[in-house]
């Protein structure tokens, strides 16, 4: 016997209070698949988050981060402060890369310069806080 709720499309829920008819999701909620018995609360992009895509009756809102921050985690679950190139984020804020390390992005950690001698090469261009060394023949 087919479940009558399976006929309820995305954007609705199967309403047990109304003999299992398909009722529209309330405002600020959605159902992305058919046959749901409740709708889901829309994600709200507040504070450091900003709305990249509005919630609709069939899909959740999508957030990104305000300028000066970048997304971390699945679906941008967190926003992390940007640093400048040549820096990394620590518990005490943005700190310059130590000598011998670099970071060419606004996120992530400082990484050691390439050791050219491991490949039998020499340093063609010295490294900086923002750039790795360039190895030559």
């Amino acid at each position: 016997l087919q479940d009558p709720c399976s006929n309820c499309p995305a954007g609705t829920f199967c309403d047990n209070n109304r003999n299992q008819i398909c009722s529209p999701c309330p405002p600020n909620s959605f159902s992305s698949a058919g046959g749901q018995r409740t709708c889901d609360i829309c994600r709200q992009c507040k504070g450091v988050f900003r709305t990249r895509k509005e919630c609709s009756s069939t899909s959740n809102a999508e957030c990104d981060c305000t300028p000066g921050f970048h997304c971390l985690g699945a679906g941008c679950s967190m926003c992390e402060q940007d640093c400048k190139q040549g820096q990394e984020l620590t518990k005490k804020g943005c700190k310059d890369c130590c000598f011998g390390t670099f970071n060419d992005q606004k996120r992530g950690i400082c990484r050691p310069w390439t050791n050219c001698s491991l490949d039998g090469k020499s340093v063609l261009v010295n490294g900086t806080k923002e750039r790795d060394v360039v190895c030559g023949p």
Epitope: F13, D15, P27, T38
Partner: nanobody, 122 residues
Framework: EVQLLESGGGLVQPGGSLRLSCAAS????????VGWVRQAPGKGLEWVSA????????YYAESVKGRFTISRDNAKNTLYLQMSSLRAEDTAVYYC???????????????RGQGTQVTVSS
């Protein structure tokens, strides 16, 4: 027990106005997310308007924006829908609704009343 009693419907000419009322009991209108849904002849339910986030924001369907205004009287525990510039396509049974948030994170709504019929016709 939650009860919702709608009133204020009737027959009105296109361009006219009506004010629907919903007297609530069994819960406090000012502390909940509440609104109006409607069902036009031969069609499914449609959300019209709602007061959300304990009054922090309001929702209006695109089809009624600028014409309908939702409000509430906390002292009377009553929800209102002021409808103006009415059109034939606004003809429907209007139900007061209480949005229900379930422990598992789901959202549904309750309509306990019989609704009030609004007919827009010349």
């Amino acid at each position: 027990e939650v009860q919702l009693l709608e009133s204020g419907g009737g027959l009105v000419q296109p361009g006219g106005s009506l004010r629907l009322s919903c007297a609530a009991s069994g819960f406090t209108v000012s502390a909940e997310d509440v609104g109006w849904v409607r069902q036009a002849p031969g069609k499914g339910l449609e959300w019209v308007s709602a007061i959300l986030d304990s009054g922090g924001s309001t929702y209006y369907a695109e089809s009624v924006k600028g014409r309908f205004t939702i409000s509430r009287d906390n002292a009377k525990n009553t929800l209102y829908l002021q409808m103006s510039s009415l059109r034939a396509e606004d003809t429907a049974v209007y139900y007061c609704a209480r949005i229900v948030y379930h422990a598992g994170g789901g959202v549904t709504f309750d309509t306990r009343g019989q609704g009030t019929q609004v007919t827009v016709s010349s």
